[in-house]
Interface confidence: low
């Protein structure tokens, strides 16, 4: 904390301008009025203050607004935003999309920092909703942000936002999120040819229904086991042995290593053992030969 000292004669700042870059830290503290700084924050970004000087300016704003900065100040923070801590940001109430954009611009070119994550969280809470414009803004800056949204929030994500998503951007998405994202991805990539389509849709297949997996099995896609293991269990269970063999292609041999894991284990339990035997992988646990297999819907009808 900067020691309180009287402002030298004639040095009292009348406005925020470039003359202040020649002020020592203690002079900034003593000679710049916090209220003046708050009303002229838009000028700060155009002045080449040192990091140390920015620390002083932040300190003055903190003193003026101990409960958190008003949005009129936040919108014009510029590079001073980089000096904020998540604790500082949690005190804010950000509702303007322009404010959010202005601060994201400051962090442009960097991965999402704790400060940005906190800012977005405060924005969403302050705004009370995630409309299309908000989602467009967030996904444009941070495609991986999709996975931090709830399924309800994801429902308003436009398919156009899906284009910039890379596989690793979906690493933290859970099946419920993929259930929402998959139909959007399917729509976004619908005009691509088979091989290109599969490359793009593959990361989203954790949300694919059975009928789409059946369709993929007819396209020689050679799905790898890592992708197969991320598929919805309820989508895998109805697949026949022949369909899984076509879906996985040369990777079907990988089922053996995964036979104790879901969804493979569940799938094995619902297949005829003689069908499993045709794979030649030594998979065990299928329905014994000679047992009557009833379709679940038929079973319900009979009961």
């Amino acid at each position: 904390e900067v020691e309180k000292t009287a402002c030298p004669s004639g040095k009292k700042a009348r406005e925020i301008d470039e003359s202040l870059i020649f002020y020592k830290k203690w002079e900034l503290e003593a000679c710049v009025d916090a209220a003046l700084l708050a009303t002229q924050m838009d000028r700060v970004n155009a002045i080449p203050f040192t990091y140390e000087q920015l620390d002083v300016l932040k300190h003055k704003l903190d003193e003026l607004y101990p409960q958190g900065y008003p949005e009129s100040v936040i919108q014009h923070l510029g590079y001073l935003f980089l000096k904020m801590s998540p604790e500082d940001i949690r005190k804010w109430n950000v509702t303007s999309l322009e404010t959010l954009k202005a601060l994201l611009e400051v962090n442009k070119g960097h991965e999402m920092s704790p400060q940005v994550a906190t800012l977005i969280d405060r924005f969403v809470k302050g705004r009370g909703q995630l409309d299309k414009d908000t989602l467009d803004t967030l996904t444009a800056f941070y495609p991986g942000y999709l996975c931090s949204l709830s399924p309800e929030e994801l429902s308003s994500v436009p398919p156009s936002s899906i284009w910039a998503v890379r596989p690793q951007d979906l690493d933290t998405c859970d099946p419920r999120q993929l259930d929402v994202l998959y139909p959007k991805a399917r729509l976004a990539f619908q005009n691509m040819n088979g091989s290109e389509y599969f490359v793009k849709i593959q990361s989203f297949l954790g949300g694919a229904p059975t009928e789409d997996l059946k369709a993929l099995s007819q396209q020689n896609v050679s799905m790898d086991l890592a992708t197969f293991m991320k598929l919805r269990t309820d989508a895998v269970l109805p697949l026949t042995v022949a369909e899984v063999q076509k879906l996985l292609g040369p990777h079907v041999e990988g089922l053996k290593a995964e036979e104790r894991h879901r969804p493979v284990r569940d799938w094995i339990l619902r297949q005829r053992q003689d069908d499993l035997d045709t794979l030649g992988l030594g998979l065990q646990g299928g329905i014994p030969n000679g047992y009557l297999v009833l379709d679940l819907s038929m079973q319900e009808a009979l009961s």
């Epitope: 070119g109 991965e111 284009w163 910039a164 691509m192 091989s195 290109e196 490359v199 593959q202 790898d224």
Partner: antibody
Framework: QVQLQESGPGLVKPSQTLSLTCTVS??????????WSWIRQPPGKGLEWIGY???????YYNPSLKSRVTISVDTSKNQFSLKLSSVTAADTAVYYC????????????WGQGTMVTVSS | DIQMTQSPSSLSASVGDRVTITCRAS??????LNWYQQKPGKAPKLLIY???SLQSGVPSRFSGSGSGTDFTLTISSLQPEDFATYYC?????????FGGGTKVEIK
């Protein structure tokens, strides 16, 4: 026909910062369909990806260079730039800028490359 | 980081030969595998993307196959203009990485 053109000094002194710019012509750098990358190739050696930038400014850097690299984009000039600080002779290479097609996941268009020598 | 291992590092072949170059990833990269051709003093040129898709304008004698960790680039009938260095590259995960290259020379 989209073309990429690298520009910048061909000689940089050790410990200084290497700065290169890639100008995109025949297409917009603001298209959401592409990532814009820098790749380098030391004389007689293989290719090394330095990093890429999306039109929004989001970047991914190679961890081996991350502490020294900054990639930025200027959509108004249809350019993106590379800054590599604290260079040594090991940074001597041909530096390429390239466009990565998001759909294909591949570098479909490359600049012709610019040789940068680090020497005093 | 995902390591990409190419083999062989160099090979000698004659015009008309069938040439196969392999690329192995240190972990599964699905189908995010590309092949490039580079001639001396020139920038690399994309041949194959997504493991098996032929880039527009590339002759059909080039083909790619594989998925997961093992990939192959095949030149069905080597032509004089095909003598160059070939690189594989994964785009599944950052950092994006290239194989060490395979130099195809005239026998």
């Amino acid at each position: 026909q989209v073309q990429l053109q690298e520009s910048g000094p061909g000689l940089v002194k050790p410990s200084q910062t290497l700065s290169l710019t890639c100008t995109v012509s025949g297409g917009s750098i603001s298209s959401g369909d592409y990532y814009w990358s820098w790749i380098r190739q030391p004389p007689g050696k293989g290719l090394e990806w330095i990093g890429y930038i999306y039109y929004s400014g989001s970047t991914y850097y190679n961890p081996s260079l991350k502490s020294r690299v900054t990639i930025s984009v200027d959509t108004s000039k249809n350019q993106f730039s590379l800054k590599l600080s604290s260079v040594t002779a090991a940074d001597t290479a041909v530096y390429y800028c390239a466009r990565e097609d998001v759909v294909k996941g591949a570098f479909d268009i490359w600049g012709q490359g610019t040789m940068v020598t680090v020497s005093s | 980081d995902i390591q990409m291992t190419q083999s062989p590092s160099s090979l000698s072949a004659s015009v008309g030969d069938r040439v196969t170059i392999t690329c192995r990833a240190s972990q599964s990269i699905s189908s995010y595998l590309n092949w490039y051709q580079q001639k001396p003093g020139k920038a690399p040129k994309l041949l194959i993307y997504a493991a098996s898709s032929l880039q527009s304008g590339v002759p059909s004698r080039f083909s790619g196959s594989g998925s997961g960790t093992d990939f192959t680039l095949t030149i069905s009938s080597l032509q004089p203009e095909d003598f160059a260095t070939y690189y594989c590259q994964q785009s599944y995960s950052t950092p994006l990485t290239f194989g060490g290259g395979t130099k195809v020379e005239i026998k």
